[in-house]
Interface confidence: low
């Protein structure tokens, strides 16, 4: 229904706290360089204005669209051109072009320092002094580094953060209480960020239809007892919610997500028997819980998929009459029978089925032509299954750090032109798939591995788009989203690459490495490893292992030495010489 004042409507629906949080996220995601104080001031102004509209919907400007109101606020910021360059040109446009322009200027890799966590005592002090400001800083810092973070979900993580601080700041040993809990939230939030970015990429590059197909497959796996009409309704609603969030319409997105959660909880009987625990929770926890609810038990009496989609005499007629609906029912039926497949795989199978019908329904004897389609799925299914087995075996053998290094070597050989920091970030993220997925039960491994890898590779593509340097990467990133992972997996050593010349300074280290946290030490070593591969792309695994072992030994020796500086300056050059010899 239409409301006289959109901003009053959203304020009333969401309540002041969520309204302010979402406006702060929106501003932080659009203008990523502004300070918290600058954004907090704007948020307060918008909130005060919203309250005047709640009191009187006919008040001046209350009838304006949210894009107009928010855009006008952003464009009124002083020194916009000095700080943001051509983004300031967006302010010369009218809505909706102005908002589109802002969206195009979102930076997936802003040049901001890493978000450092203060030490426990300091954190607890500032949290106790002003919890609202503390959480505002959290929303601001995360949102500007992750401009497509799913806004209602970011409110959920802020709530988690709040609960952890409330609990741990009351304890004697704050540090040991906070660290593991906040690390857990950070890890989950980072995964949430890359997953959501993938959804927005799907929406931006391939439109709502592509996202809806993803949603149908995912929902059918989770709710195999829901009928096709119910799944379609949920997929349509979920597509709307994600479209809004990806498009910067965060108030609408959060409001519609709350409505969807309410609908699911009121219609459990036609959706799933697993929802009650989620539905007992307050709003943010409820929506989060529903988004990762366990799969319902599959109906015991599902007929073979072939009956309706291969053996039925009317296949081509049904397909011709309503292509999208027929393919949708195929995707639904196949997905509800296969919670053990990744969504990417299910979409590849649906695509293969569609291509088969397109070809066969034009022939003289269609049934003879499409009769073998299910058998033709086999290689498509085997490929990711083998990928999971090979990689999980390797992870179990090497552990997370060793597995990351193996991936780093592999990907540097596939795309040596890509910058070393990007390769290291990608390999570290890809390597986490082992810890995340390989410990799961067999039937959950494939969906976990492939859908996580797809999300990480989407980030590789986004970063590469900014500065395209590798034809291999461009080729894989240009195709459809579901084909990306198989494309990257199939890449081999880039034969066109001219190896980097050996530069001693790249492999020269100083005693400051000894005091770095373990994670930073690993990144330094992995940076050196990528550089070694760029120097010798065809180095054997054995050669690289020799060099890395020598390197680790060197660090260990010098970091334990009484005079570290002398050790680094004398042993360092010897290490460089040995490396060159080992790789010769």
């Amino acid at each position: 229904e239409a409301h006289k004042s959109e901003i009053a409507h959203r304020y009333n629906d969401l309540g002041e706290q969520h309204f302010k949080g979402l406006v702060l996220i929106a501003f932080s995601q659009y203008l990523q360089k502004c300070s918290y104080d600058e954004h907090a001031k704007l948020v307060q102004e918008v909130t005060d204005f919203a309250k005047t509209c709640v009191a009187d919907e006919s008040a001046a400007n209350c009838d304006k669209s949210l894009h107009t109101l928010f855009g006008d606020k952003l464009c009124a910021i002083p020194n916009l051109r000095e700080n943001y360059g051509e983004l300031a040109d967006c302010c010369t446009k009218q809505e909706p072009e102005r908002n589109e322009c802002f969206l195009q200027h979102k930076d997936d890799n802003p040049s901001l320092p890493p978000f450092e966590r203060p030490e426990a005592e300091a954190m607890c002090t500032s949290f106790k002094e002003n919890p609202t400001t503390f959480m505002g800083h959290y929303l601001h810092e995360v949102a500007r580094r992750h401009p497509y973070f799913y806004a209602p979900e970011l409110l959920y993580y802020a709530e988690q953060y709040n609960e952890i601080l409330t609990q741990c700041c009351a304890e004697a040993d704050k540090e040991s209480c906070l660290t593991p809990k906040l690390d857990g939230v950070k890890e989950k939030a980072l995964v949430s960020s890359v997953r959501q970015r993938m959804k927005c990429s799907s929406m931006q590059k391939f439109g709502e239809r592509a996202f809806k197909a993803w949603a149908v497959a995912r929902l059918s796996q989770t709710f195999p007892n829901a009928d096709f009409a119910e799944i379609t309704k949920l997929a349509t609603d979920l597509t709307k919610v994600n479209k809004e969030c990806c498009h910067g319409d965060l108030l609408e997105c959060a409001d519609d997500r709350a409505e969807l959660a309410k609908y699911m909880c009121e219609n459990q009987a036609t959706i799933s028997s697993k929802l009650q625990t989620c539905c007992d929770k307050p709003l943010l926890k409820k929506a989060h819980c529903l988004s990762e609810v366990e799969h319902d038990t599959m109906p015991a009496d599902l007929p073979a998929i072939a009956a309706d989609f291969v053996e039925d005499q009317e296949v081509c007629k049904n397909y011709a009459e309503a292509k999208d609906v027929f393919l949708g029912t195929f995707l639904y039926e196949y997905s509800r029978r296969h919670p053990d497949y990744s969504v990417s795989l299910l979409l590849r199978l649906a695509k293969k089925y569609e291509a088969t019908l397109e070809k066969c329904c034009a022939e003289a004897n269609p049934p003879a032509c499409y009769g073998t389609v299910l058998a033709e799925f086999q290689p498509l299914v085997e490929e990711p299954k083998n990928l999971v087995k090979t990689n999980c075996d390797l992870y179990e053998k090497l552990g997370e750090y060793g597995f990351q290094n193996a991936i780093l070597v592999r990907y540097t050989q596939k795309a040596p032109q890509v910058s070393t920091p990007t390769l290291v970030e990608a390999a570290r993220n890809l390597g986490r798939v082992g810890t995340k997925c390989c410990t799961l039960p067999e039937d959950q491994r494939l969906p976990c591995v492939e859908d996580y890898l797809s999300a990480i590779l989407n980030r590789v593509c986004l970063l590469h788009e900014k500065t395209p340097v590798s034809e291999h990467v461009t080729k894989c990133c240009s195709g459809s989203l579901v084909e990306r992972r198989p494309c990257f997996s199939a890449l081999t050593v880039d034969e066109t690459y001219v190896p980097k010349e050996f530069k001693a300074e790249t492999f020269t280290f100083h005693s400051d490495i000894c005091t770095l946290p373990e994670k930073e030490k690993q990144i330094k070593k992995q940076t050196a490893l990528a550089e070694l591969v760029k120097h010798k792309p065809k180095a054997t695994a054995e050669q690289l292992k020799t060099v890395m072992d020598d390197f680790a030994q060197f660090l260990d020796t010098c970091c334990k030495a009484a005079d570290k500086d002398t050790c680094f300056s004398t042993e360092g050059p010897n290490l460089v010489t040995r490396c060159k010899d080992a790789l010769a």
Epitope: N225, C265, E266, Q268, A269, T270, S273, L275, Q276, C279, D280
Partner: nanobody
């Protein structure tokens, strides 16, 4: 189609008893927790009691604790509410709902307690 049909309501003296039934169809009754909710005209719905899918875990609102008993028969796909020591303030339309929700998907049954 999901259907919930309540019965057993009526007019009763304060201190008296009633047994409400809710016959369910169109879904796997034995897989879902169920609740009783009541509503007085002009007021919002009030959650009364809930029972888990197996019938082992029951929960009650403070206002009716010790007087009402919720139970279920999964074979018969029926939910029950045994109401004892009824008070005038228990007067309302009683609905059964799926899960612990206060949303109403049924007609309800009127319970009137006179003093």
């Amino acid at each position: 189609e999901v259907q919930l049909v309540e019965s057993g309501g009526g007019l009763v003296q304060a201190g008296g008893s009633l047994r409400l039934s809710c016959a369910a169809s169109g879904f796997t009754f034995g897989s879902f927790g169920m609740s009783w909710v009541r509503q007085v005209p002009g007021k919002g719905p009030e959650w009364v009691s809930a029972i888990d899918s197996g019938g082992t875990d029951t929960r009650y609102a403070e206002s009716i604790k010790g007087r009402f008993i919720i139970s279920r028969d999964n074979a018969k796909k029926t939910l029950y509410l045994q109401m004892n020591s009824l008070k005038p303030e228990d007067t309302a339309v009683y609905y059964c709902t799926i899960g612990q929700s206060t949303s109403r998907g049924s007609q309800g049954t009127q319970v009137t307690v006179s003093s």
